[in-house]
């Protein structure tokens, strides 16, 4: 699905004191989905503020969020997953601001895990593998992954590789010899569902072999 190409227009300027953003996670706990919202301004006084979602729900008209410190959270099976929901910030019965959101367009996958790198001496390469809980899911099954790696001494010089599988081969000749590398991976929905990058996986660290001077090859 092509989705919408952006032409540079600004986002809807509902930048009042109660501007908020949300992300959904589908089948995050068995068949339960979650929706997490937070104010964009961390200084908002949230004491009497509540969040409510109405529309595109199964069997109920509206649901209230639970407050967990500075975030608002729902875990439920009741998302219809088709049509737009109205998410409102409320004080008592009064709505302060609302957004129409299709929950399938704000999906944030779970972070990949079990990232590892194995050096293959004969092939002169590194095989990067990782796992994702989404392989077992029924909705958000297809993801694009972003593998990022850098030489540990290069603070911000990350190299990124996009892939749809959970396995990547890095050629030894593309890496510096006898160097320590950091590698990490994150995921984003890639078929029908849209949304945000997951959190990064925990980083994995690996060292490249030194060059063997007699052959010009690395050890």
């Amino acid at each position: 699905e092509s989705g919408y190409a952006q032409n540079g227009d600004l986002e809807d300027a509902e930048l009042d004191d109660y501007s908020f953003s949300c992300y959904s996670q589908l089948e995050v706990n068995g068949s339960q989905h979650s929706l997490t919202c937070a104010f964009e301004d961390p200084d908002v006084n949230i004491t009497n503020l509540e969040f409510e979602i109405c529309g595109a729900l199964v069997e109920v008209k509206c649901l209230n969020f639970r407050k967990l410190q500075e975030i608002y959270f729902i875990e439920t099976k009741k998302f219809l997953l088709i049509g737009k929901s109205n998410i409102c910030v409320k004080v008592g019965e009064k709505s302060l601001t609302c957004k129409k959101i299709d929950l399938t367009t704000i999906v944030k996958p779970e972070a990949p895990f079990d990232l590892s790198v194995v050096y293959r001496e004969g092939a002169n390469d590194f095989v990067v593998t990782f796992n994702t809980s989404h392989l077992q899911k029924k909705y958000v099954k297809v993801l694009m992954h972003d593998v990022a790696y850098r030489q540990e001494k290069d603070e911000n010089k990350w190299t990124h590789v996009n892939l749809s599988s959970t396995k990547l081969t890095l050629l030894q000749r593309k890496l510096q010899p006898a160097a320590m590398y950091e590698i990490k991976v994150r995921s984003i929905p890639d078929h029908y569902f849209k949304g945000f990058w997951s959190e990064w996986s925990p980083s994995y660290y690996f060292r490249t072999p030194e060059i063997n001077n007699s052959s010009g090859e690395m050890d």
Epitope: E1, Y4, N7, D9, D12, I82, K84, Y139, Y192
Partner: antibody
């Protein structure tokens, strides 16, 4: 009530362009994407593309890429569909339709008849 | 492009009787329990009107004699008890993949 009101009928020569407007009312304009669907005489329905009035982002049917342009004007809650290099097979009723969800159409304009004839 | 094939092309049903329209897609339009199939009614000289979205969800204001079912590649629109005002052409539409395509239509008439 929620309404989409389209501009009037057009007669165009082959090779010309046509620009059809669709004015939305009765809801917050930036909350819903607006799409264009056409129907040739006695034929079925064909999706042409859509626009998100919030961002100006567009999605076009590949069949019309390069010939169709969709724009929106938030100050007047109006979207526009311009089709260029018209040919006789573009003779059709052009509908704008609001997307209630991804991507089904819950509110439709009354339609604009575009006739392409030499 | 996903091709939607409706059957029959036309249907004549007695008042009060059941009318059933089928829509078959060239590939699945379902993601688990999310069925991206929708149904519209179009009367002569009017724009289409949404009846059913997500295969089985009745649009607000649509009489409950209309119902939808199906998954994957096979979907059905049912009018449980045909009324005179139901004479129209009915279209299915998929929204899993761009370009979003419609069936060729089924004309429903009174027998």
């Amino acid at each position: 009530q929620v309404q989409l009101v389209q501009s009037g009928a057009e007669v165009k020569k082959p090779g010309a362009s046509v620009k059809v407007s669709c004015k939305a009312s009765g809801y917050r304009f930036t909350d819903y994407e607006l799409h264009w669907v056409r129907q040739a005489p006695g034929q079925g329905l064909e999706w042409m593309g859509g626009i998100d009035p919030k961002t100006g982002g567009t999605a076009y049917n590949q069949k019309f890429k390069g010939r169709v342009t969709m724009t929106s004007d938030r100050s007047t809650s109006t979207v526009y569909m311009e089709l260029s290099s018209l040919r006789s097979e573009d003779t059709a009723v052009y509908y704008c339709a609001r997307s209630g969800g991804r991507w089904y159409f819950d509110v439709w304009g009354q339609g604009t008849t575009v006739t392409v004839s030499s | 492009d996903i091709v939607l094939t409706q059957s029959p092309d036309s249907l004549a049903v007695s008042l009060g009787e059941r009318a059933t329209i089928n829509c078959r897609t060239s590939e699945s339009v379902s993601i688990h329990l999310l069925h991206l199939m929708h149904w519209y009614q179009q009367k002569p000289g009017q724009p289409p009107k949404l009846l059913i979205y997500g295969a089985s969800n009745l649009e607000s204001g649509v009489p409950d004699r209309f119902s939808g079912s199906g998954s994957e590649t096979d979907f059905t629109l049912t009018i449980s008890s045909l009324q005179a005002e139901d004479v129209a052409v009915y279209y299915c539409q998929q929204s899993i993949k761009d370009p979003y395509t419609f069936g060729g239509g089924t004309k429903v008439e009174i027998k």
